[in-house]
Amino acid sequence: VSLRIQEGCSHLPSCCPSKEQEPPEEWLKWSSASVSPPEPLSHTHHAESCRASKDGPLNSRAISPWSYELDRDLNRVPQDLYHARCLCPHCVSLQTGSHMDPLGNSVPLYHNQTVFYRRPCHGEEGTHRRYCLERRLYRVSLACVCVRPRVMA
Amino acid sequence: VSLRIQEGCSHLPSCCPSKEQEPPEEWLKWSSASVSPPEPLSHTHHAESCRASKDGPLNSRAISPWSYELDRDLNRVPQDLYHARCLCPHCVSLQTGSHMDPLGNSVPLYHNQTVFYRRPCHGEEGTHRRYCLERRLYRVSLACVCVRPRVMA
C-alpha cells in the first residue's frame, strides 16, 4: 500500500494506491507523524493565564507563556499540528511571575513547516481513484519568546 | 518512482522503487522538506554572543538568545534540520540587553520531530535493491526560552 509523493501533484517520487487498497486506518498510522506539542501540556490551568509558573512544563514557566491549540486535519501529514498562542502581550516579570514588564514583548516564533496533503491524483476518477501527497508550506507558531522591542534605525 | 513508508521498515503504507529507478535527485526532492530554521538568523554576529539585540531577527532580540546549527543528512527526510543553541545560561536583562539576570534561566525548547530515513527494504539485496522510509523520532531544539527556575515541592 502506498502513496504518491508530489509537488503540486505533478511530479517527484511517486506511487499511488487506490482508495480501496488503502484503508484510512493505514493512512492515519503514517499521517499521525507528530501528535504532541514540543512540551507536555500543563495539567493545571497555569498556561491559560498571563503568569509565569514556578513549576509545570516549559510553556507555563516561560516569562512569555503560551498555550497550545490543536490543528487536526486527517488528510494531512502530519495530521496533528500545534500552534502556540501567546498569553501575554508583554513579558512577565521574573521577580513576581505575574506583573508585565513593558520593556519586553512576548511574540510568537513562526515556522513554515512542510506538510503533505492527500489529494486525488491528477486525471484520476471513479470509485477506485488514487491519491497523491501534495507538498505545502504551512505556517505554525512554535512558541512565544520574550524579546526586546525592535528599534528602527 | 516511489518509496516504501514503514515503521521500523516492517509495516504501514508502502511502495518501494529500485535504486536504479530512483535517482538520489528524485529522493532528495522530497527529502528537502524543511531547510530553514524558523527565523532568519542575524546577519551580523549578534546571535553568537550573550546579548539581546534591539534589531535583527527574533533569535537575536530574545532575552534568551540562540543561534542555529545545521544538521544535514542526505538519507533523511527532511535532509536539513536546525538545532537552536542557547547563547546564555540565564536570561539577559530587558533593561541593558547584556547583563544576565540570575532569576531567569535560558533553556532550550525540545521537540521530538518525526523524520524518515532511507534504508534498504527488509530482505532486499543485490544491485537494484529497493529502499524504505523508516520513521523515527528525532530530538531537535526549536528555540531558547526564558523561564522562572523550577521550584521543587
Epitope: - | E25, K29, S32, P37, L41, H43, L74
Partner: antibody
Framework: EVQLQQSGPELVKPGASMKISCKAS????????MNWVKQSHGKNLEWIGL????????SYNQNFKGKATLTVDKSSSTAYMELLSLTSEDSAVYYC???????????????WGQGTSVTVS | DIQMTQTTSSLSASLGDRVTISCSAS??????LNWYQQKADGTVELLIY???SLHSGVPSRFSGSGSGTDYSLTISNLEPEDIATYYC?????????FGGGTKLEIK
C-alpha cells in the same frame, strides 16, 4: 554569469584576526549556501564550514570551530569568514564556493572564488 | 569523518590518451561524490557531481563512475588544457572531505 570575487592577499601578524570577503554576483545570493575551503601548501583541500545566506544557519568542521566564524551581509550579497588568533598553521589560500542547489538538493560546490592568500608572519 | 584517498598523487600521460584517476572512501558514500579540477593559477572548477553527472559547460570527454567506496574520473581524449590537479570530494556526510589530489602532467 555567476561570479565570486574574493578580497586580496593578506599578510598578518601571529595572534591577530582578519576577515576575508566573498562578493557574489550573477545569481540570487540568498538561494545558495556558501562554503569555505582551506588549501595549505598548494595541495590539501579542507572544508571549513558553510553558511546559508538566507537565514544565517551554519555548520562548521570541528577542526575550525573557534578558528573561523562565518557571516553574511545580504544587502551587499557578501559572505565573510573571520579567522581568529592566527598562527603560521593558518597560512594558506582560502576559497569561498557556492553550493549548487537545484531547488531541493545541495549537490556540489559549483562555483568557486579565485582564492585569498593569507600569510601569517 | 570520512577519509578520501587518491592513491596516485601524480601521473603522466600523452595528449590523446585515455586517463583514469581513482578515489576511494573510508566508508560507503552512496555515490555522493564530486570531482574538481584545479589549474596551476589556483582556479577551481566543478567537473562531475553525484559520481557521473557532468556539470554544465564541462566537455563530454570527462566522465565519472563508481559505487560504494570506489570511484573514478576518466578523461577519454587528453587535451592540453586538461593539465591540472584533480580532487574528489564526498558530500555523503558533514564535514565534507576531499581526496589529496592527483596532478596530471604531459609526457
Amino acid at each position: 554569469e555567476v561570479q565570486l570575487q574574493q578580497s586580496g592577499p593578506e599578510l598578518v601578524k601571529p595572534g591577530a584576526s582578519m576577515k576575508i570577503s566573498c562578493k557574489a554576483s550573477g545569481y540570487s545570493f540568498t538561494d545558495y549556501t556558501m562554503n569555505w575551503v582551506k588549501q595549505s601548501h598548494g595541495k590539501n583541500l579542507e572544508w571549513i564550514g558553510l553558511i546559508n545566506p538566507y537565514n544565517g544557519g551554519t555548520s562548521y568542521n570541528q577542526n575550525f570551530k573557534g578558528k573561523a566564524t562565518l557571516t553574511v551581509d545580504k544587502s551587499s550579497s557578501t559572505a565573510y569568514m573571520e579567522l581568529l588568533s592566527l598562527t603560521s598553521e593558518d597560512s594558506a589560500v582560502y576559497y569561498c564556493a557556492r553550493e549548487g542547489y537545484d531547488g531541493y538538493l545541495y549537490f556540489a560546490m559549483d562555483y568557486w572564488g579565485q582564492g585569498t592568500s593569507v600569510t601569517v608572519s | 569523518d570520512i577519509q578520501m584517498t587518491q592513491t596516485t598523487s601524480s601521473l603522466s600521460a600523452s595528449l590523446g590518451d585515455r586517463v583514469t584517476i581513482s578515489c576511494s572512501a573510508s566508508q560507503g558514500i552512496s555515490n555522493y561524490l564530486n570531482w574538481y579540477q584545479q589549474k596551476a593559477d589556483g582556479t577551481v572548477e566543478l567537473l562531475i557531481y553525484y559520481t557521473s553527472s557532468l556539470h554544465s559547460g564541462v566537455p563530454s570527454r570527462f566522465s565519472g563512475s563508481g559505487s560504494g567506496t570506489d570511484y573514478s574520473l576518466t578523461i577519454s581524449n587528453l587535451e592540453p588544457e586538461d593539465i591540472a590537479t584533480y580532487y574528489c570530494q564526498q558530500y555523503s556526510k558533514l564535514p565534507y572531505t576531499f581526496g589529496g589530489g592527483t596532478k596530471l602532467e604531459i609526457k
